[in-house]
């Protein structure tokens, strides 16, 4: 680890704090051992070099120890997510030590000053961990640092400065501004802990990205592509949260990382799975639902340790609220066209029927365009567990229900004005469940009628397990 005393001088000299509070020299960071699920409880303040509070407050040396590290604050008070996370950790790990790192005085400043304070806060945590390591039975392996926003980079510094290696760091939407593209020693990075997992929920490729876009852990998970989170749109926020403003949309999306982590703690029986993929677009196309070679993982607390040579970017869809889990399906549809129809942009919908439930009518998102006489892959997801799939209804939306669809139809007509009979043929649909990895093939209910046109529907029934049909000789190639 790099020495905390470098050319910059002592870390304490680096503190960026208002002159008004420099009169009394106090540690700028406090460690509060949360001894109760009750947020009103005072907890116990731990003091470096003082063993009595550890004993008095029942610090369990052999148990897991969580350090929760908040981020930048405009209000100077602990935000409500903190209580939720503390409570969830206590619920899941009854014997664990849950420590809140209070660096509010250093975080309640201009963002740039708070950023400049992250290093010294990380050092304070490292010193606390070094002191705890002197105690019998305390092991860094059992230490899990959980940092939100700016706190994720604080955790990175702590992991960097500590003597030894902490077991795990979870970065909950690590802050982007002033960290994007930074050197690995100046931000959270995979070498800061034995396992570094990251949730990215507010990344933007345009405008200011509050959360960091680049992968910074061993696994980097981008729920809903890491940008627009369901339930955080202006309309949702206006109805359900204090302050229906852009600020609240930002807070909702940025903070979603915390709630996904809380969900993974309290809804153990409903784990959300993420799938490795090179980018969000490929995931949206449905071509990344493989679990082979560690290509899928649970998200949040239940993530399995993966220490790849390279960063692993993973994606998933979620619901708008807890429990966030959805069920992902890859749908492969081979589209035949007997007429040269030019460029065509059908608006397809599917309804899945299962042994447990039926899905709602789900849109097939066309990421680029429908390829004719080729296999097209789509991603669909349902909020409920449908059980075993039995049949699929495919609908081609008819009369335009939106200006966009009207424009699509007009464009289609302009490119092929003498082709009123738009028609495609689909003989079967191959489906793969992301959660079970089960592959199924669905055949057109009426093999004589496989054509579909605007305003029409086709029904498909399960005709076999797996994807290979009797008349197919080439083996199915597993998708990446």
């Amino acid at each position: 680890s790099p020495t905390p005393f470098g050319p910059e001088g002592q870390l304490e000299d680096e503190l960026h704090k208002p002159k008004a509070i420099q009169t009394e020299v106090k540690p700028s960071v406090r460690f509060n051992l949360r001894t109760s699920k009750d947020p009103e409880h005072e907890g116990c303040y731990l003091s470096l070099g003082h063993s009595q509070p550890l004993e008095d407050c029942g610090f369990n040396m052999t148990a897991k120890t969580f350090f929760i590290i908040h981020g930048w604050t405009m209000s100077g008070i602990f935000e409500n997510w903190l209580h939720k996370l503390v409570s969830a950790l206590h619920t899941r790990e009854k014997d664990a030590n849950v420590v809140v790192v209070d660096w509010l005085p250093l975080a309640h400043q201009l963002y740039t000053d708070a950023v400049n304070n992250t290093r010294v806060v990380g050092h304070s945590i490292a010193r606390m961990l070094d002191w705890l390591q002197e105690k019998d039975d305390f092991s860094l392996e059992n230490v899990h640092l959980i940092g939100y926003s700016l706190g994720a980079h604080v955790a990175g510094y702590a992991g960097n400065f500590v003597k030894g290696t902490v077991g795990r760091i979870t970065g909950l939407d690590p802050a982007g501004p002033m960290f994007e593209g930074a050197d690995i020693h100046k931000r959270l990075s995979p070498d800061d802990a034995d396992f570094v997992d990251v949730l990215h929920t507010y990344t933007r490729s345009f405008g200011l990205s509050i959360g960091i876009q680049m992968p910074v852990g061993h696994i980097d998970i981008y729920p809903n592509g890491g940008d627009f989170q369901p339930g955080c749109g202006l309309n949702d926020v206006l109805g359900s949260m204090a302050y229906g403003t852009i600020t609240e949309v930002v807070k909702c999306e940025h903070e979603r990382a915390v709630h996904l982590f809380v969900d993974s703690l309290v809804n153990q029986d409903k784990p959300s799975f993420a799938f490795q993929c090179t980018d969000s677009n490929r995931f949206k196309k449905g071509i990344c639902l493989s679990c082979r070679k560690n290509r899928c993982n649970s998200i949040g607390y239940n993530a399995k340790k993966m220490r790849n040579k390279r960063n692993s970017k993973m994606y998933l869809k979620t619901r708008a609220g807890m429990p966030f889990r959805v069920y992902h399906y890859q749908m492969k549809i081979h589209v035949f066209s007997y007429k040269n129809m030019g460029e065509i942009e059908p608006t397809f919908y599917v309804t899945l029927y299962g042994t447990n439930a039926d899905s709602q009518t789900l849109p097939l998102e066309i990421v680029e365009r429908i390829e004719q006489n080729a296999t097209n892959t789509f991603l669909v997801y349902t909020e409920e567990d449908l059980g075993d799939l039995l049949k699929i209804q495919l609908t081609w939306e008819g009369a335009s229900q939106s200006w966009y669809n009207l424009w699509k139809e007009l464009r289609s007509y302009l490119s092929q004005p003498h082709n009123p009979g738009r028609e495609l043929n689909i003989r079967r649909i191959r489906v793969k469940s992301g959660e079970t990895q089960r592959k199924l093939t669905f055949c057109a209910e009426d093999p004589e009628n496989t054509s579909i046109s605007p305003g029409r529907e086709l029904w498909f029934r399960k005709c076999r397990d797996g994807w290979r049909m009797k008349n197919e000789t080439s083996p199915t190639v597993e998708l990446p």
């Epitope: 209070d102 509010l104 005085p105 949260m241």
Partner: antibody, heavy 120, light 112 residues
């Protein structure tokens, strides 16, 4: 038991300065934030802001920025409210009230109030 | 800022009857299943006293005849059965994690 004891009533002239104290006992002073609340005669309660009793960082509500200052004497477990350049409209009862940093920010203990009269 | 509107401004209730006071917030004060709404009682010449926190939790030493309910933007304080000593002014107060924190205009309760 937990107590917040405030200094006695004050009679001041416009333009003068007043400093009201709030002494805490029965709990660890630095583990709870301290609020200041104004109540003009016959009027409702108005939150003025709060001070972090550990770091000394104050936060003021918009209407109380400028002439108002929160401070601490941590060794004496005491919080202070100073009002400079007093105006007639500062005539009110001022309360200190604590809240838990980790809780849901309600004010569980209040001082008895300090009545300030500003009159020429 | 979140504006809290209390109604009625005053009410008179017979001994042993129910008193109901309403508080409406200009925006939701909920967060992930919790409501950050509190109620205080203030008698003349005294400081306010915490009655209810987080919409429905009874403050320390507060008798069970006081109860709070509601979520989002609409909250209610109920006192039943009303006793002589309950004559006071009652204030609602929102304490979301984004100050400024604000109080309602108060409701004066008289006992008939």
């Amino acid at each position: 038991q937990i107590q917040l004891v405030q200094s006695g009533p004050e009679l001041k002239k416009p333009g003068e300065t007043v400093k009201i104290s709030c002494k805490a006992s029965g709990y660890t002073f630095t583990n709870y934030g301290m609020n200041w609340v104004k109540q003009a005669p016959g009027k409702d309660l108005k939150w003025m802001g709060w001070i972090n009793t550990y770091s000394g960082v104050p936060t003021y509500a918009d209407d109380f920025k400028g002439r108002f200052a929160f401070s601490l004497e941590t060794s004496a477990s005491t919080a202070y409210l100073q009002i400079n350049n007093l105006k007639n409209e500062d005539t009110a009862t001022y309360f200190c009230a604590r809240f838990s940093y980790y809780g849901r920010h309600y004010f569980d203990y209040w001082g008895q109030g300090t009545t300030l009269t500003v009159s020429s | 800022d979140i504006v809290l509107t209390q109604s009625p401004a005053s009410l008179a209730v017979s001994l042993g009857q129910r008193a109901t006071i309403s508080c409406k917030a200009s925006q939701s004060v909920d967060y992930d299943g919790d409501s950050y709404m509190n109620w205080y009682q203030q008698k003349p010449g005294q400081p306010p006293q915490l009655l209810i926190y987080a919409a429905s939790n009874l403050g320390s030493g507060i008798p069970a005849r006081f109860s709070g309910s509601g979520s989002g933007t609409d909250f209610t304080l109920n006192i039943h059965p009303v006793e002589e000593e309950d004559a006071a002014t009652y204030y609602c107060h929102q304490s979301t994690d984004d100050p400024p924190w604000t109080f309602g205009g108060g409701t004066k309760l008289e006992i008939k």
